[in-house]
């Protein structure tokens, strides 16, 4: 999937965690098919 950023964001961010995607893990691998 693709995400485009660089437009105004209306998502609220926690002040304690970065809103960037966490490091990839194999648990996030998409199912084949």
């Amino acid at each position: 999937s693709e995400t485009t950023t660089g437009t105004s964001s209306n998502s609220s961010q926690s002040t304690s965690n970065s809103g960037l995607a966490p490091n990839p893990t194999n648990a996030t691998t998409k199912a084949a098919g």
Epitope: T5, G6, T15, S18, G19, L20, A21, N23, P24
Partner: antibody, heavy 118, light 107 residues
Framework: QVQLVQSGAEVKKPGASVKVSCKAS????????MNWVRQAPGQGLEWMGE????????TFNQKFKSRVTMTRDTSISTAYMELSRLRSDDTAVYYC???????????WGQGTTVTVSS | DIQLTQSPSFLSASVGDRVTITCRAS??????LAWYQQKPGKAPKLLIY???TLHSGIPSRFRGSGSGTEFTLTISSLQPEDFATYYC?????????FGQGTKLEIK
């Protein structure tokens, strides 16, 4: 040790495309997002986007969305960035950089100079 | 997008001086600010992340502080190898953005 080694300098005509490679070594390539950042001559740093090496999910800067293609080949631990419909103002050094969630862009490639000239 | 404004843009100093560079964000980025050093013809090098954490191998004369919208990078005693351009970068949200840079020159 972590190393990111990029492909060599390119000279392109306006309207053409360029594809830059970034070969990673010294760490698990699939464990970190690969980012692309460019720097025009005498200018600052501009983030283009990133790719998740496992899922191939991408996040782009809106400015580049319509012209940039990011891919990867996990079998050879290499990421690619292709920029199409080149213009003279795309003349820049293009960097790949590993992004760690905690530390941000912690390791960078040496840069690839792309010159767009007729 | 979050705008980052660095000040000053240019800074002249001497070896042994203490210098401070400021980075202001257009909205709160919590602690998620990184600092990079770049020398001519070279890639940027990470110095500090999460506002104040020194990256591995970076000398302790580099110190980052701040949170929210105002951050500072302090070099306690300038060494000859410290003359370079410094960039701040927020890693709180997409799109990742950088400050315009501060060029540190020898006086």
């Amino acid at each position: 040790q972590v190393q990111l080694v990029q492909s060599g300098a390119e000279v392109k005509k306006p309207g053409a495309s360029v594809k830059v490679s970034c070969k990673a070594s010294g760490y698990d390539f699939t464990g970190y997002h690969m980012n692309w950042v460019r720097q025009a001559p005498g200018q600052g740093l501009e983030w283009m986007g990133e790719i998740n090496p496992i899922t191939s999910d991408k996040t782009f800067n809106q400015k580049f969305k319509s012209r940039v293609t990011m891919t990867r080949d996990t079998s050879i631990s290499t990421a690619y960035m292709e920029l199409s419909r080149l213009r003279s103002d795309d003349t820049a050094v293009y960097y790949c950089a590993r992004r760690d969630y905690g530390t941000s862009l912690d390791y960078w490639g040496q840069g690839t100079t792309v010159t767009v000239s007729s | 997008d979050i705008q980052l404004t660095q000040s000053p843009s240019f800074l002249s100093a001497s070896v042994g001086d203490r210098v401070t560079i400021t980075c202001r964000a257009s909205k709160s980025i919590s602690k998620y600010l990184a600092w990079y050093q770049q020398k001519p013809g070279k890639a940027p090098k990470l110095l500090i992340y999460a506002g104040s954490t020194l990256h591995s191998g970076i000398p302790s004369r580099f110190r980052g502080s701040g949170s929210g919208t105002e951050f500072t990078l302090t070099i306690s005693s300038l060494q000859p190898e410290d003359f370079a351009t410094y960039y701040c970068q927020q890693h709180n949200e997409y799109p990742i953005t950088f400050g315009q840079g501060t060029k540190l020159e020898i006086k």
